[in-house]
Interface confidence: low
Amino acid sequence: EPPTACREKQYLINSQCCSLCQPGQKLVSDCTEFTETECLPCSESEFLDTWNRETRCHQHKYCDPNLGLRVQQKGTSETDTICTCEEGLHCMSESCESCVPHRSCLPGFGVKQIATGVSDTICEPCPVGFFSNVSSAFEKCRPWTSCETKDLVVQQAGTNKTDVVCGPQDRQR
């Protein structure tokens, strides 16, 4: 009686179980009563990552340099190419099909987390006692200068964008 289901790594065709092609190979011809499944290796720049009965291998992903992408890991006959973003850029989406420049934190905000190839800069407002006077993708909020430790007094209060201004103490006689 012809089978209705096949074992793992097999497929049912013409009422018989044929072996699937291993990862890295594509199907050329199905098995018959007298012959095994015929498979061929994927050519350069192609891959198949599962046991399969595909007649065509998939093209490796192209990490387009004009989209800010570079190769993180070259593809093999069994794996796709993995792209990442160039320095200063991060992926626009999870699939990383293109890249955008890292966001800078505006004055009054500091970098909470520096961007990576897959995530953007995370900014945070400078809390009281801290400031940032630059637009930067790297700089954290900096603490206000401590006038007292320099034996000076605060002449102008600091803000989230400016440091305090220190000056000499008025020595009244």
């Epitope: 050519s43 387009d64 800010g68 190769v71 070259k74 160039e86």
Partner: antibody, heavy 121, light 107 residues
Framework: EVQLVESGGGLVQPGGSLRLSCAAS????????MSWVRQAPGRGLEWVST????????YYADSVKGRFTISRDNSKNTLYLHMNSLRAEDTAVYYC??????????????WGQGTTVTVSS | SYELTQPPSVSVSPGQTASITCSGD??????ACWYQQKPGQSPVLVIY???RRPSGIPERFSGSNSGNTATLTISGTQAMDEADYYC?????????FGGGTKLTVLG
């Protein structure tokens, strides 16, 4: 038609200086990294330097580091190679080449006709 | 520093297949490309990213790269393919060229 035309080559004494230029046309110059490659008489290709599309990233061969400077003027569609402290071994045909992309350098897909630099006393 | 090694010369009869190799430590982990240079002319890119062919390059040119060796294959070699061939790869922010291979088409 994509074209690169080098100029500025010539005869110079050892220790002298020279500035090579490469005028680009037929493509968006500011979108591509550019390179200089040289070829000494009867020898193979030798990479000299590469600059990214914005001019912010530069790369040099050890043999020219500290003596040569690559730069570009995207408003003029021109690539430059400033060569100082020239030596006899710098004698070669210098080619300007367009890279395949902005940031990552897969290959040089367009080459100029070359300009000859001769360093001799 | 990284080095790419090519045979100085390769000979082939017209219509036959020519293979030019380029070897370097773990070259298969990098992308290789190939240039053709005829006497008195500028180099021309014939293969990039291991096996991709720029438009205008005949289908008889193909490339592969795995392990420590990249190979340029010219099937059905013609007299016009006689030239110097150079492999190239990027390694640690520097471009490296092979020493070049002179392809001679016999006859």
């Amino acid at each position: 038609e994509v074209q690169l035309v080098e100029s500025g080559g010539g005869l110079v004494q050892p220790g002298g200086s020279l500035r090579l230029s490469c005028a680009a046309s037929g493509f968006t110059f500011s979108s591509y990294a550019m390179s200089w490659v040289r070829q000494a008489p009867g020898r193979g290709l030798e990479w000299v330097s590469t600059i990214n599309n914005s001019g912010g990233g530069t790369y040099y061969a050890d043999s020219v580091k500290g003596r040569f400077t690559i730069s570009r003027d995207n408003s003029k569609n021109t690539l430059y190679l400033h060569m100082n402290s020239l030596r006899a071994e710098d004698t070669a045909v210098y080619y300007c080449a367009k890279e395949g992309g902005k940031y990552y350098y897969y290959a040089m897909d367009v080459w100029g006709q070359g300009t000859t630099v001769t360093v001799s006393s | 520093s990284y080095e790419l090694t090519q045979p100085p010369s390769v000979s082939v009869s017209p219509g036959q297949t020519a293979s030019i190799t380029c070897s370097g430590d773990k070259l298969g982990d990098k992308y290789a490309c190939w240039y053709q240079q005829k006497p008195g002319q500028s180099p021309v890119l014939v293969i990039y990213q291991d096996s991709r062919r720029p438009s205008g390059i005949p289908e008889r040119f193909s490339g592969s790269n795995s392990g420590n060796t990249a190979t340029l294959t010219i099937s059905g070699t013609q007299a016009m393919d006689e030239a110097d061939y150079y492999c190239q790869a990027w390694a640690s922010s520097t471009v490296v060229f092979g020493g070049g291979t002179k392809l001679t088409v016999l006859g």
